[in-house]
Interface confidence: medium
């Protein structure tokens, strides 16, 4: 593959090829400046598979609070506003990176961790298993 | 609020209360071992608001590859398998943390960055604007 030349102004490290421990600047840069913040704010209520936003908190993790989706119904909302159990509301999950304090309670030492979070819900056709 | 006692075995840092630069171990711990990775793998096809997954790649970012959802239709799939334009397929977006190499091309120095990604799609009732 392409090898990008190493910037001569980089901080020193013992292993240039595969850093196990790296320095991370926590001043978060936000790439979302051009997004319209209103656009997905009420989907949780307007969806045919609506969800609630539930607090998942862990003081030893950054971010310490993650809002997780919990589908309100097993079925989906039909045109009449009723729950249709011929369809299923299911959570859309995503693996995200978080920082975990390691050793515990240390303010400046972390380990990268992957966690699975539910972001919202979608309405799917159920898988029907036919019994022979 | 509660102050968690600082672990005496922590690495040194200049500012104990608000670290700007921290050490991060990149050996990822995965908390998702008990989850079934196939569980939501086919929702993108079975959803009434189906989506395609597009590769978003950036070698200066960790993770360098992120799969982004793009809704297939403006409307939603109805019971007959047709697209119903009285409903809208919309992307469910989530802010996620990534590591951005800083300075560029440095293997062991990063900055925390928040980016907005589309994880999947959901079917919503449209907002109807009535003209007076």
């Amino acid at each position: 593959g392409i090898t990008i030349p190493r910037n001569p102004g980089c901080p020193n490290s013992e292993d240039k090829n595969f850093p196990r421990t790296v320095m991370v600047n926590l001043n978060i840069h936000n790439r979302n400046t051009n997004t319209n913040p209103k656009r997905s704010s009420d989907y949780y209520n307007r969806s045919t598979s609506p969800w609630n936003l539930h607090r998942n908190e862990d003081p030893e993790r950054y971010p310490s609070v993650i809002w997780e989706a919990k589908c309100r119904h097993l079925g989906c909302i039909n045109a009449d506003g009723n729950v249709d159990y011929h369809m299923n509301s299911v959570p859309i999950q995503q693996e995200i990176l978080v920082l975990r304090r390691e050793p515990p309670h240390c303010p400046n030492s972390f380990r990268l961790e992957k966690i699975l979070v539910s972001v919202g819900c979608t309405c799917v056709t159920p898988i029907v298993h036919h019994v022979a | 609020g509660i102050t968690i006692p600082r672990n005496p075995g922590c690495p040194n840092s200049e500012d104990k209360n608000f670290p700007r630069t921290v050490m991060v171990n990149l050996n990822i711990h995965n908390r998702n071992t008990n989850t079934n990775p196939k569980r939501s793998s086919d929702y993108y096809n079975r959803s009434t608001s189906p989506w395609n997954l597009h590769r978003n790649e950036d070698p200066e970012r960790y993770p360098s590859v992120i799969w982004e959802a793009k809704c297939r239709h403006l409307g939603c799939i109805n019971a007959d398998g047709n697209v119903d334009y009285h409903m809208n397929s919309v992307p469910i977006q989530q802010e996620i943390l990534v590591l951005r190499r800083e300075p560029p091309h440095c293997p062991n120095s990063f900055r925390l960055e928040k980016i907005l990604v589309s994880v999947g799609c959901t079917c919503v009732t449209p907002i109807v604007h009535h003209v007076a």
């Epitope: 979302n32 997004t35 950054y62 303010p107 | 609020g1 670290p19």
Partner: antibody
Framework: EVQLLESGGGLVQPGGSLRLSCAAS????????MYWVRQAPGKGLEWVSY????????IYADSVKGRFTISRDNSKNTLYLQMNSLRAEDTAMYYC?????????????????WGQGTMVTVSS | NIQMTQSPSSLSASVGDRVTITCQAS??????LNWFQQKPGRAPKLLIY???NLETGVPSRFSGSGSGTDFTFTISSLQPEDIATYYC?????????FGQGTRLEIK
């Protein structure tokens, strides 16, 4: 000193607009989700809106949805509430509040810092 | 939305009395509950967070307990400066919701 200072309130006619601001100081604003909460005269507290630390997630109370827009400028350490199509029932003291979720930095608890409030009166 | 039912809506007590206010959530909120004090013309002040943790600088006569759906706020020995309205607030689910308030007066 950790502080929130609201401004932009005043008297406005029904159907009119106002933009409230909340200037933060004494803490790293960009790390904290923020809220607007209001209190009608002689009434209880009512949550109005939420915005995530970088502005990518916003949530509104049903009573203001489609009329109010919460936003933030992290470079200016300022939170905003754009209020359109104002109604008499929007008359209230409007407070901004910080959700101190950054406990990993050993700070306090949710809604630990509030501004002093700015009064919005909607009347003809 | 989660409903928070606070009781009583008002109460009158004497200096030195033990005062108890209850708050009931319409569904399980774990311990994600705050208690606030609000004096006339002032912004709310956080007293208790996570149901039972005393915020820094708050006198120890204030305490909180409970989890799930039932919560209690207690002032062990009422002082004249405690005259205020007290609110519970859940922050387990968005939208965040408050109790309707309890107005505390001195007899």
């Amino acid at each position: 000193e950790v502080q929130l200072l609201e401004s932009g309130g005043g008297l406005v006619q029904p159907g009119g607009s106002l933009r409230l601001s909340c200037a933060a100081s004494g803490f790293t604003f960009s790390f904290y989700p923020m809220y607007w909460v209001r209190q009608a005269p002689g009434k209880g507290l009512e949550w109005v809106s939420y915005i995530s630390s970088s502005g990518g997630m916003t949530i509104y109370a049903d009573s203001v949805k489609g009329r109010f827009t919460i936003s933030r400028d992290n470079s200016k350490n300022t939170l905003y509430l754009q209020m359109n199509s104002l109604r008499a029932e929007d008359t209230a003291m409007y407070y901004c509040a910080r959700e101190s979720v950054a406990r990993w930095l050993q700070s306090g608890a949710a809604f630990d810092i509030w501004g002093q409030g700015t009064m919005v009166t909607v009347s003809s | 939305n989660i409903q928070m039912t606070q009781s009583p809506s008002s109460l009158s007590a004497s200096v030195g009395d033990r005062v108890t206010i209850t708050c009931q959530a319409s569904q399980d909120i774990g311990t994600f509950l705050n208690w606030f004090q609000q004096k006339p013309g002032r912004a709310p002040k956080l007293l208790i967070y996570d149901a039972s943790n005393l915020e820094t600088g708050v006198p120890s006569r204030f305490s909180g307990s409970g989890s799930g759906t039932d919560f209690t706020f207690t002032i062990s020995s009422l002082q004249p400066e405690d005259i205020a309205t007290y609110y519970c607030q859940q922050y387990d689910y968005l939208p965040i919701t408050f109790g309707q308030g309890t107005r505390l007066e001195i007899k």
